[in-house]
Interface confidence: low
């Protein structure tokens, strides 16, 4: 018996087609992805093949103005239209709190939404009961397939799930649910979830009875043969893991942003054992036409976005200096504003020991592309912010050793004075440079804001300590020459859309007046 699994993950609000790098589509003839194009390909496969499942491994939420405006209603609407068979909850599904998940998505979705390792407690337990499930048994042709969901256990530190959801260890939580499916005589089981490729592989190895793992969170690109675009494969598709009980378990992921549709064919024997598995992600390029009915629907929903982008988010009563003459040479107040917004966006439920889990931000000055003039009545719009942060990146959470941070700050000024983009703007950090010293030895003072304290204060950076830092995904991936970050990071979790972070902060503050306040000094 043959099953075709079509899968997406980490779509992050890319409902419209995008450029090859998943930013805003500029030249339509070379654009990719989007739900209209995805629908065309899915329907093509559904017509051609008998047993097809369309699955999403989480993080539909967060990433473009679509999510900012529609807050998840767009996800339910278009996933319903594409007739998804199941979705696993990702960490970003909690970005607007549990209510922001329940109302627009859980109550509106016509497909099961799954996570076995999220347990509700307190008053939420009854409110959310039945709106998401640990597993679902789906009829496919003459057979049944069990889908069991999972979500990153780090979600409380990456998003806003509140205090009434407990995120258990994935493997611990999945095993009893898989066992339950087995007792129901379900012998073909897919683990669908959002914890990253390393955990996906562990699930394949450790959870007895899981036949296939369809994952997300780490934006992993797997491919067999010559890849069709710029993404470099992290391994073959499917990636085969030998389980502890000796089975070959295929593990798949489909990069991110709706650029590819994962396509996996599995052959099962009559006892539900995987006999063979093969496939590849399908690049959704312009050779695949956009479905006209979905496209028309997109255009209808688009109108509200155009109106939103010119509306006032808040006001500035000072000039927001995002000029390259400032931000690539010294502390600039636009950098301070953005970093303050990045930290504010990562305020999480603190316990008695920590006022917050992260206090530090770094931001490459070259990523700040425009100032905002306060003389236009002080008005700040989404459109203004899109000029400051035009690349459609995310502000991510990483864990770095102090020694790596020190290297990053040395790199920040290793060729100072040439208007290069690597000069770092900061938050929760006080740095002093001595440019008379040789490159690689110019940081003379580096103090960081404590997290394990009731009154935050600045302490000298400890080389061996592990610190959490918020930074652009561009830096996490080694951009602007920050190879040491990419090479030495101990953990990397993708965060929220950059413009959304800043716009939310400005809306919250209403009136802003960021200053240059001595975060970066030269001795």
């Amino acid at each position: 018996w043959e099953l075709t699994i079509l899968h997406t993950n980490d779509v992050h609000s890319r409902l419209e087609q995008t450029s090859e790098d998943s930013s805003k589509c500029v030249n339509a003839s070379r654009c990719m992805g989007g739900v209209a194009r995805l629908f065309t390909k899915v329907q093509q496969i559904r017509r051609a093949e008998p047993n097809v499942l369309l699955l999403d491994a989480g993080d539909q939420y967060q990433g473009t103005i679509w999510f900012t405006v529609y807050k998840g209603a767009e996800v339910a609407h278009f996933m319903n239209a594409l007739r998804y068979d199941a979705m696993a909850l990702g960490n970003h599904e909690f970005d607007n709190g549990v209510e922001g998940l329940i109302e627009p998505l859980l109550k509106e979705a016509k497909f099961p939404i799954l996570s076995a390792n999220i347990k509700a407690k307190g008053p939420l337990a009854s409110q959310i009961s039945g709106l998401y499930l640990p597993y679902k048994v789906l009829p496919v042709g003459d057979e049944v397939v069990g889908i069991v969901g999972y979500t990153s256990k780090e979600t409380p530190f990456l998003s806003n799930p509140g205090t009434n959801l407990v995120f258990e260890d994935e493997i611990t939580a999945l095993q009893p649910e898989v066992d339950k499916l087995k007792t129901l005589n379900v012998n073909k089981i897919i683990a669908l979830g959002h914890s990253g490729f390393e955990t996906d592989k562990l699930i394949a190895q450790k959870v007895r009875g899981v036949d296939v793992v369809v994952g997300g969170h780490s934006n992993t690109f797997l491919y067999t043969g010559n890849p069709p675009s710029k993404e470099v494969p992290a391994g073959k598709y499917p990636f085969i893991v030998t389980s502890d009980d000796g089975r070959k378990v295929p593990v798949v992921q489909a990069y991110a942003f709706g650029k590819y549709l994962g396509y996996l064919k599995i052959e099962f024997d009559e006892r539900g054992n995987v006999i063979s598995s093969h496939g590849n992600p399908i690049l959704l390029n312009s050779s695949i036409p956009e479905d006209p009915s979905i496209k028309a629907d997109i255009n209808k929903w688009r109108i509200k976005l155009d109106n939103y982008s010119t509306q006032e988010l808040g006001k500035t009563i000072v000039y927001l200096d995002g000029s390259s003459q400032s931000c690539r040479f010294r502390e600039c107040n636009m950098g301070n504003l953005i970093c303050d917004a990045m930290i504010n966006n990562n305020l999480r439920h603190a316990d008695e020991m920590f006022w917050n889990h992260v206090s530090m931000c770094i931001l490459n000055g070259g990523g700040i592309r425009s100032p905002i003039d306060e003389r236009n009545n002080g008005t700040i719009t989404w459109e203004n912010l899109a000029a400051v942060l035009p690349f459609g990146g995310t502000f991510d959470l990483v864990q770095l050793k102090g020694s790596t941070l020190k290297k990053a700050f040395e790199h920040s000024v290793h060729r100072y004075g040439q208007s290069t983009g690597e000069f770092l703007q900061v938050g929760g950090i006080h740095v002093v440079y001595d440019l008379s010293r040789k490159p690689g030895d110019r940081v003379v003072k580096l103090d960081v804001l404590c997290t394990k304290c009731r009154v935050p204060s600045y302490d000298p950076l400890k080389m061996d300590e592990i610190y959490k830092v918020i930074l652009p995904n561009f830096l996490a991936n080694g951009g602007d020459g920050f190879q040491m970050i990419k090479d030495e990071l101990l953990r990397h979790d993708s965060g929220d859309q950059d413009i959304n972070v800043v716009s939310t902060y400005i809306s919250k503050m209403k009136v802003i007046y960021p200053a240059v306040e001595g975060r970066i000094k030269f001795s």
Epitope: K121, K153, E154, F157, V166, E168, D169, T172, E198, L202, Q205, D244, D351, E352, M353, F354, H357, K401, K452, D464, I466, L490, R491
Partner: antibody
Framework: QVQLQESGPGLVKPSETLSLTCTVS????????WSWIRQPPGKGLEWIGY???????NYNPSLKSRVTISVDTSKNQFSLKLSSVTAADTAVYYC???????????????WGQGTLVTVSS | DIQMTQSPSSVSASVGDRVTITCRAS??????LAWYQQKPGKAPKLLIY???SLQSGVPSRFSGSGSGTDFTLTISSLQPEDFATYYC?????????FGGGTKVEIK
Amino acid sequence: QVQLQESGPGLVKPSETLSLTCTVSGGSIERYYWSWIRQPPGKGLEWIGYIYGRGSTNYNPSLKSRVTISVDTSKNQFSLKLSSVTAADTAVYYCARESQESPYNNWFDPWGQGTLVTVSS
Amino acid sequence: DIQMTQSPSSVSASVGDRVTITCRASQGISSWLAWYQQKPGKAPKLLIYAASSLQSGVPSRFSGSGSGTDFTLTISSLQPEDFATYYCQQGNSFPRTFGGGTKVEIK
């Protein structure tokens, strides 16, 4: 599943260095925190310290000046060295994995079966 | 360091009894508490984590509750294999610390 096995001498002389190794089988050492915990005969449990699979460490302040924990990823092993031992260091020494990676959420599971180290001349 | 105080230090009970063990932290630890069972000559075994989550494979007669500084482990109906020493452990901050243990003995 992951299994842990402690090994090392059962008898160490006072003032010498106690050395133990924990071998991890059935899983990679790289993505977890690995701890040493000890239990003097008839007494309670004391956490000694951890090492992350990629090398960072954290030690109990009460033992910090005497403890070194290291990792050898190629052998899937991590080790404990405790210097200047006295009779008070006589204990069953356990190695254990922290079941979750979050720095706020660390429980120990699984554990090795433990090895008794006696400090005596 | 956070001190963990368990009470009682020992309890005598019969098969079928309901047994309750308490653990108090010297400062708030939210829900970052685990309970372990240890039998003579064996390593501790994780029973409960995050104050109330049952570890996979642990019988449902074990349950945990509490938050902040006061926590409870309950064995709803004591079985012969439950006679052992039980330890609590805080997972809130370093150094990790354990309670002194509660020995559950046969009456």
